[in-house]
Interface confidence: medium
């Protein structure tokens, strides 16, 4: 004979637990049904009647099987520096992530609480570590033989062009200027851009730092809003 299936509410055997999607109600001392995601317990169970569930109201949700008396409130609307990547429904909370050019300075369980603009490295400084979804750009001074003449959150230090005859020597913020004879260059001309952080959790390739005789200051700056530090600009 097959074992009898107990219907909720029922008293569990001593030492046993309730089944999946049931909970033990301390007051009734019975195993009772949980409410499905998108619902909440409107009336708790008793010894003779099971849990009565009701749908979550607008702007509230439950994501799990539960027996809560009220659904959880969805988070506030996404701010102007954020993108809504998941809408508030009866079964899930709203999720806000940072828009391109910003990173998450203060995260929460899902999504971002506070976005901050990616740091821009000023001329003479290049990107040592690109920004990601959750970390800011790190700037470093351009090593001898390299330069950056832009204010950018993506440009790395590039090698000076190699001249047959130098008209103006290059420095950290300016390329070398050659006389009219055509220059040779170890890298293709034009700005080198690093990828912007995107809202998916993709891996970014980091620029290979070129050998440097400059001090090894990594310019690791605190997350979150802060005054512009050396090598970076607030704009």
């Amino acid at each position: 004979l097959p074992a009898q299936v107990a219907f909720t509410p029922y008293a569990p055997e001593p030492g046993s637990t309730c089944r999946l999607r049931e909970y033990y109600d301390q007051t009734a001392q019975m195993c009772c049904s949980k409410c499905s995601p998108g619902q909440h317990a409107k009336v708790f169970c008793t010894k003779t009647s099971d849990t009565v569930c009701d749908s979550c109201e607008d702007s509230t949700y439950t994501q799990l099987w539960n027996w809560v008396p009220e659904c959880l409130s969805c988070g506030s609307r996404c701010s102007s520096d954020q993108v809504e990547t998941q809408a508030c429904t009866r079964e899930q909370n709203r999720i806000c992530t940072c828009r391109p050019g910003w990173y998450c300075a203060l995260s929460k369980q899902e999504g971002c609480r506070l976005c901050a603009p990616l740091r821009k490295c000023r001329p003479g400084f290049g990107v040592a570590r690109p920004g990601t979804e959750t970390s800011d750009v790190v700037c470093k001074p351009c090593a001898p033989g390299t330069f950056s003449n832009t204010t950018s959150s993506t440009d790395i230090c590039r090698p000076h062009q190699i001249c047959n005859v130098v008209a103006i020597p290059g420095n950290a913020s300016m390329d070398a200027v050659c006389t009219s004879t055509s220059p040779t260059r170890s890298m293709a001309p034009g700005a080198v851009h690093l990828p912007q952080p995107v809202s998916t959790r993709s891996q970014h390739t980091q620029p290979t730092p070129e050998p440097s005789t400059a001090p090894s200051t990594s310019f690791l700056l605190p997350m979150g809003p802060s005054p512009p530090a050396e090598g970076s600009t607030g704009d």
Epitope: Y23, D25, L64, W65, Q109
Partner: nanobody
């Protein structure tokens, strides 16, 4: 699934203090409340305190009000039970348990996941 591990139990003299820890791991922890229960030989399991991981709201059994304090560290996913002015009748195995979603409605009505428990003995 939520996993819970208690620690911090021990032998203490009446009037002494202990702090229990409940380390939680798993998804959706912010939806849960963590409650402390105790079991003593010959007694029914008793709800001691509860804290909502999201709101931080708390509840206590009358027998421990003013002596026990429950707190949480969301960064470490850990709940603490600070027990002061301990009495022999506080002796028992203390378990933490989790429940969706809060404990605004009194101590836990039910529980999903249990830790193994930590023994607290109050004796001179």
């Amino acid at each position: 699934e939520v996993q819970l591990v208690e620690s911090g139990g021990g032998l203490v003299q009446p009037g002494g203090s202990l702090t229990l820890s409940c380390a939680a791991s798993g998804r959706y922890l912010e939806y849960y409340a963590i409650g402390w229960f105790r079991e003593a030989p010959g007694k029914e399991r008793e709800g001691v305190s509860c804290i909502s991981m999201s709101a931080g709201s708390t509840n206590y059994a009358d027998s421990v009000k003013g002596r026990f304090t429950v707190s949480r560290d969301n960064a470490k996913n850990t709940v603490y039970l600070q027990m002061n002015s301990l009495k022999p009748e506080d002796t028992g195995v203390y378990h933490c348990a989790s429940e969706p979603y809060g404990c605004e409605d009194g101590l836990l009505r039910g529980y999903d996941y249990w830790g193994q428990g930590t023994q607290v003995t109050v004796s001179s």
